[in-house]
Interface confidence: low
């Protein structure tokens, strides 16, 4: 079951999967000036059997200027175009991907691939967040999000991560600095959003893991 939407956006943070659950699709995207070969796959698919998992299909790019190939490029479905992208980067946490049954490792790069990879995650996928350079994490702890299925709907749990600039104070977004009483919570805490305002968006956040917010990671 593919996840309906993308992992939560955390300001000043990026996410990365350490391993990919079977069923995950990776778009075969090529960098500017290149395109998929005429009979090339639209995506790679993580598949597996009882012993191991691997990526089916291979992405292949060719120069758009090549004359002996068709110029028509199969357009990507709109939904796929809108999926979240993850920058290619080294894993944020040391995880032995091979030790996770039912998961594929990060696919090796292919020639002339795009700078960003577009994944289509499945239920049960976990991604890890980290603050981008120049920002630091408040509330250290599990900064992960899991795609969960509830009542026929999929949703991502909210990672326990707030990234703030070095010069900012350690406060929640939208929270004002306490004026008088250092022990009291600013009054705006309960009123500044008027009619709005985790359960781990944990809302929690992994079912049996004590990781993060109310909606599914209450632990």
């Amino acid at each position: 079951e593919l996840c309906d939407d993308d992992p939560p956006e955390i300001p000043h943070a990026t996410f990365k999967a350490m391993a990919y659950k079977e069923g995950t699709m990776l778009n075969c995207e090529c960098k500017r000036g290149f395109r998929r070969i005429k009979s090339g796959s639209l995506y790679m698919l993580c598949t597996g059997n009882s012993s191991h998992s691997s990526w089916d299909n291979q992405c292949q790019c060719t120069s758009s200027a090549t004359r002996n190939t068709t110029k028509q490029v199969t357009p990507q479905p709109e939904e796929q175009k809108e999926r979240k992208t993850t920058e290619m980067q080294s894993p944020m946490q040391p995880v032995d991907q091979a030790s996770l049954p039912g998961h594929c490792r990060e696919p090796p790069p292919w020639e002339n691939e795009a700078t960003e990879r577009i994944y289509h995650f499945v239920v049960g996928q976990m991604v890890y967040y980290q603050c981008v350079q120049g920002y630091r994490a408040l509330h250290r702890g599990p900064a992960e999000s899991v795609c969960k299925m509830t009542h026929g709907k999929t949703r991502w749990t909210q990672p326990q991560l707030i990234c703030t600039g070095e010069m900012e104070t350690s406060q929640f977004p939208g929270e004002e600095k306490p004026q008088a009483s250092p022990e009291g919570r600013p009054e705006s805490e309960t009123s500044c959003l008027v009619t709005t305002t985790d359960f781990q968006i944990q809302t929690e956040m992994a079912a049996t893991m004590e990781t993060s917010i109310f909606t599914t990671e209450y632990q």
Epitope: E189, L193, Q202, F214, T216, Y218
Partner: antibody, heavy 103, light 109 residues
């Protein structure tokens, strides 16, 4: 009784699409009761079993507003309805909207 | 019927310490984080403790939370009159795929 009500909840001061929003209600003199959750980013929802089929949660990203519509109202639906943002627990709550169901 | 069980009331004198219990099951407290909320009369609930024992900024150190197995507790030391409020525990429930609250404990100081 039998009618529907749509409660709105406008967010400000943070990135609306980055955090889930929950709806919790509280009947007079009673405790808190979770109704459901909506992801403002994609619009996906998850409702408490008790309200399945009667509640619909939506959002309007252009106005950073989430909505909770409850149909087939009964007298026992009389309560204060809160929306609450989800980060490290329900850290920001709306002031609540009192919905009274009477004939 | 609340998903978590709390004593309906608790009473203690100023300056003393009080503990409020919250009992659940393996599908909620046993496998998920516990949260505590304080609701002063006529106001919206306020997050007091998150992830079992963490305090949001602005919450006094007099408030502490703990969890063991399928139970959790909130302790308030150096009680003050302004601590008079209703206290709720909450957790995600894997079986229900939703948040469950305790019935609430009315604290009288």
């Amino acid at each position: 009784p039998g009618a529907s009500v749509k409660v709105s909840c406008k967010a400000s001061g943070y990135t609306f699409t980055s955090y889930y929003m929950h709806w919790v209600r509280q009947a007079p003199g009673q405790g808190l009761e979770w109704m459901g959750i909506i992801n403002p980013s994609g619009g996906s929802t998850s409702y408490a079993q008790k309200f399945q089929g009667r509640v619909t949660m939506t959002r309007d990203t252009s106005t950073s507003t989430v909505y909770m519509e409850l149909s087939s109202l009964r007298s026992e639906d009389t309560a204060v309805y809160y929306c609450a943002r989800d980060i490290l627990g329900l850290d920001y709550w709306g002031q609540g909207t009192l919905v009274t169901v009477s004939s | 019927q609340p998903g978590l069980t709390q004593p309906p009331s608790a009473s203690e004198t100023p300056g003393q310490r009080v503990t409020i219990s919250c009992s659940g099951s393996s599908s909620n407290i046993g496998s998920n984080y516990v949260y505590w909320y304080q609701q002063l009369p006529g106001t919206a609930p306020k997050l007091l403790i998150y992830r079992n024992n963490q305090r949001p900024s602005g919450v006094p150190g007099r408030f502490s939370g703990s969890k063991s197995g399928t139970s959790a507790s909130l302790a308030i030391s150096g009680l003050r009159s302004e601590d008079e409020a209703d206290y709720y525990c909450a957790a995600w429930d894997d079986s229900l795929s939703g948040v469950v609250f305790g019935g609430g404990t009315k604290l009288t100081v």
